[in-house]
Structures are given as C-alpha cells and as structure tokens.
C-alpha cells in the first residue's frame, strides 16, 4: 500500500494473506469458514492462508493450508478481465473477533464513494519495503469514463477504478487479490495498476465484485 498507514487494529477481520511457504504472495478475503476470495492472477498449486492477525508472522494467527482453487472461467491472462478466484480451505477457519466473514455487495457503489484498500504489499516502489502490519489507505471510486481516459482499451467492463487525484495513494505488489471495501461491503479486489506504483493520476484497477456475486455463491455451492 502506497502512502497509507497501519489499519486500526482488528478493523479488517476478513483480510487474509496468501503465502507461498512463508513468503507473501497475495491478499484475499474470507467469504465464509471454508472459502477465500482473491484475484485469479494469484493462482498457485498450494496456498498457506494467514488469518486472524494484522501482523504477518504472528504466532496467534491461524494458518490454514489450501490446495483447491477455482478461477473464474472467463479470466484472461491477456486482458485480466474477470480477475477473481475462490480458494477452498483444507480445514475450516475459526471465526472470532479477529476472524470474520466479509459482506458481499448487494449493489454496485457509485463513483465518488470513499473506500479503503488494504494489504501487506510493499509500501515503496520500485524499491520494495514490506511491512509486517496490515496497511490501509482511503481512495475514491472513479467513473469508467474518467478511468478510460487513462487506461483506454486496457479497461474492461468488470473492472473498477479507484484513486485520489494528484495523490500517490494506491495498492502495489503483494496487495493483489486484497479487498477494496466501501460502506462496509466488498466492492473490489486489487487487480492491477501502473509501475512504479503510486504514480499520481494513475488509478488502481480492481475486479468489480458486485458483478460476480452470483458466480461466487454458485461456485461455493457447487464445490461444497
């Protein structure tokens, strides 16, 4: 997270980290006791999922292995459209004050809405500095028309843009798959942006979760 600050302790109990061994790979969100939602481009053969602590490496955190993941069937490695994936935990997460399910959206929030993006990704770019504590930054949703002015034909209709004009506030490497939460509901998953991260007036691009709630619920039901 660029130009952010440590999240208020316990304010993101649905935030998870997907680890490859002990190394941060991506962010994600807990949908229920068995399922994590992340970005499709974060796919690996096996995952270790960190839950229940804002601090990576915290011994009190839950660490659960996951070996099954289901990319959206429409995901494209070329355009990165439909960049979302469900990861099935090998054992159930124990819900607590620090481990909660995220609220999936019942509607798409409009441009101008203030949202929070969070993650353990690098806080500097192109030189990397990985924090141990979960970082947060507030950004505003940007209309597709305004975002298309920046990204032109790279933008697809299930992508959502967010940022602050003339500001560095943005996500970065390691934050991918993590949550963009607006008015208490999950509206986006970190998908992509420009490099180096935090270039003013280059918005972050997110998978627009409100367009995929049916696929999320159907996929969890199908692979119960």
């Amino acid at each position: 997270i660029i130009d952010g600050a440590p999240c208020a302790r316990g304010s993101h109990p649905w935030q998870v980290a997907l680890l490859s061994g002990n190394q941060l790979h991506c962010g994600g969100v807990l949908v229920n006791e068995r399922w994590v939602l992340t970005a499709a481009h974060c796919k690996m053969n096996e995952y270790t999922v960190h839950l229940g602590s804002d601090t990576l490496g915290d011994r009190r955190a839950q660490r659960i292995k996951a070996s099954k993941s289901f990319r959206h069937p429409g995901y494209s490695t070329q355009t990165h459209v439909n960049d979302l994936m469900l990861v099935k935990l090998n054992s159930q997460a124990r819900l607590s004050s620090m481990v909660k399910k995220v609220r999936l959206p019942s509607r798409c929030e409009p441009p101008g809405t203030t949202c929070t993006v969070s993650g353990w990704g690098t806080t500097t770019s192109p030189d990397v500095t990985f924090p141990s504590d979960l970082m947060c930054v507030d950004v505003k949703l940007i209309s597709p028309q305004d975002c298309t002015k920046v990204y032109k034909d790279l933008l697809e209709n299930s992508m959502l843009c967010a940022g602050i004009p003339d500001s560095k506030k943005n996500a970065c490497n390691g934050d991918a798959g993590g949550p963009l939460v607006c008015r208490g509901t999950l509206q986006g998953l970190v998908s992509w942006g420009t490099f180096p991260c935090g270039q003013p007036n280059d918005p972050g691009v997110y998978t627009q979760v409100c367009k995929f709630t049916k696929w999320i619920n159907d996929t969890m039901k199908k692979h119960r």
């Epitope: 190394q23 481009h41 070329q78 490099f195 991260c197």
Partner: antibody, heavy 127, light 108 residues
C-alpha cells in the same frame, strides 16, 4: 545511475559449461522490484531471450534452453549469473545482461521490457 | 510459443522521411509489446513499452500503436542517428519472451 557489466571467459570448449556474471552498480538487486535477465545474439542474427530471475529468486527460462540453463542471484555481491551447460558452436554469441522493468503491478507485473542493458560480452565456443 | 514476424526485414530511407515498421504476433498479445533500437556493436535500447508508451529519454518522433496481433513503430521524421536495426518483443506472463527478426533501417 544503474549500470550492468557482464564478465566471464570469452572462449569456451564444446561440451563444457559457459559461466557469465552480471554485476549491478547504482542500485540493489535484492530490494528492487525488477526482473534481471540474459539475452544473446549470435553473429549477424537477432536477439534470443535466455531467461530471467526476479529479485525474490523466482526463475523463468526459455523452454528451448531450459534443460541447460541456470540463472542465480548473489545479493551479497549484487550480481546475477548465467550457467549454460553442454555448449556447442551454436551457442557462440554476444551475451547481454539486462534489467526487466515490469509494465505494472498485480496482474500486469509479469510483463516487462528490458530498460537497462550491459554492453555485452562475446563468447566463442571452439576447441 | 508465440511467433513475432517483423516487416520489412530491411528498408532504405532518407533523413526527414516518415518510416513505419510493423510487427505481427501469431496470436493475440493484448498490448504487451515493446520496441528496441540497436546500433552496430551496441546493446539494444528500449524505445516503446506496452505498445504505445514512450520510454523516458526517447525522442517524441518515435511512436507505437496497435493491440492484439498487429503493431506498428513509426518514426515521424527520420534523423541521422535513427539508422539502426529495430526489434519488437512480446512479453507474456509465461515464457518464452520472444523477439521479432529485426528491421534494418539504412540510408537511401
């Protein structure tokens, strides 16, 4: 300003292993969000990508060379290296090391252009 | 593997001419295409990344366009220092990263 410098023997015998090192100055391999790669150019021919290594240690190789190639990083010396085994005359080329600049973060991070190059070193395979 | 085909393989032009080089991918590569310039005995130099973004320090007479399978590098007004060989390169998330065969721009 970042600079890359290739070094290694200019002559290698057939069936032996070609070993080259790229020394990076003006920046750190271990804490920079870039790829570090090797490209070669046979005399009078075009460019061929050999492989790349990410600062975290992940490697990516050209499938046509994969069985013979190893790329590694020595962060303490700020160097990355190429080893190409069982060489033949067809491996005679100018070998370049280069930095791969990602086109974006997240899903666009795996795509990159080589924005800083070494000046190249000529390697001849001959007995 | 994705094949990159450049055309023409060589061309003769005069200072001040508008020069266009094309690159065709054997399958769609979205906008993941870079252009390089190489002078004899020198390392290649990145000119254009992501099909149309100008690398810093590169003169604005160079421009790139295209998406999918067909891409173009244009030099709006050829200068003496532009006589060189130009390569396109596609950068997929999975190897191999491949270069076109090159286009040599010579003095007419």
């Amino acid at each position: 300003q970042l600079q890359l410098q290739e070094s290694g023997p200019g002559l290698v015998k057939p069936s032996e292993t070609l070993s080259l090192t790229c020394t990076v100055s003006g920046g750190s391999i271990s804490s920079s969000d870039y790829y570090w790669g090797w490209i070669r150019q046979p005399p009078g021919k075009g460019l061929e990508w050999i492989g790349s290594i990410y600062y975290s240690g992940s490697t990516y190789y050209n499938p046509s060379l994969k069985s013979r190639v190893t790329i590694s990083v020595d962060t303490s010396k700020n160097q990355f290296s190429l080893k190409l085994s069982s060489v033949t005359a067809a491996d005679t080329a100018v070998y370049y090391c280069a930095r791969g600049r990602p086109l974006g973060y997240g899903a666009r991070h795996y795509y990159y252009g080589m924005d800083v190059w070494g000046q190249g070193t000529t390697v001849t395979v001959s007995s | 593997d994705i094949q990159m085909t450049q055309s023409p393989s060589s061309l003769s032009a005069s200072v001040g001419d508008r020069v266009t080089i094309t690159c065709r991918a054997s399958q769609s590569i979205s906008s993941y295409l870079n252009w390089y310039q190489q002078k004899p005995g020198k390392a290649p130099k990145l000119l254009i990344y992501s099909a149309s973004s100008l690398q810093s320090g590169v003169p604005s007479r160079f421009s790139g366009s295209g998406s999918g399978t067909d891409f173009t590098l244009t030099i709006s007004s050829l200068q003496p220092e532009d006589f060189a060989t130009y390569y396109c390169q596609q950068s997929p998330p999975f190897p191999p990263l491949t270069f076109g065969g090159g286009t040599k721009v010579e003095i007419k």
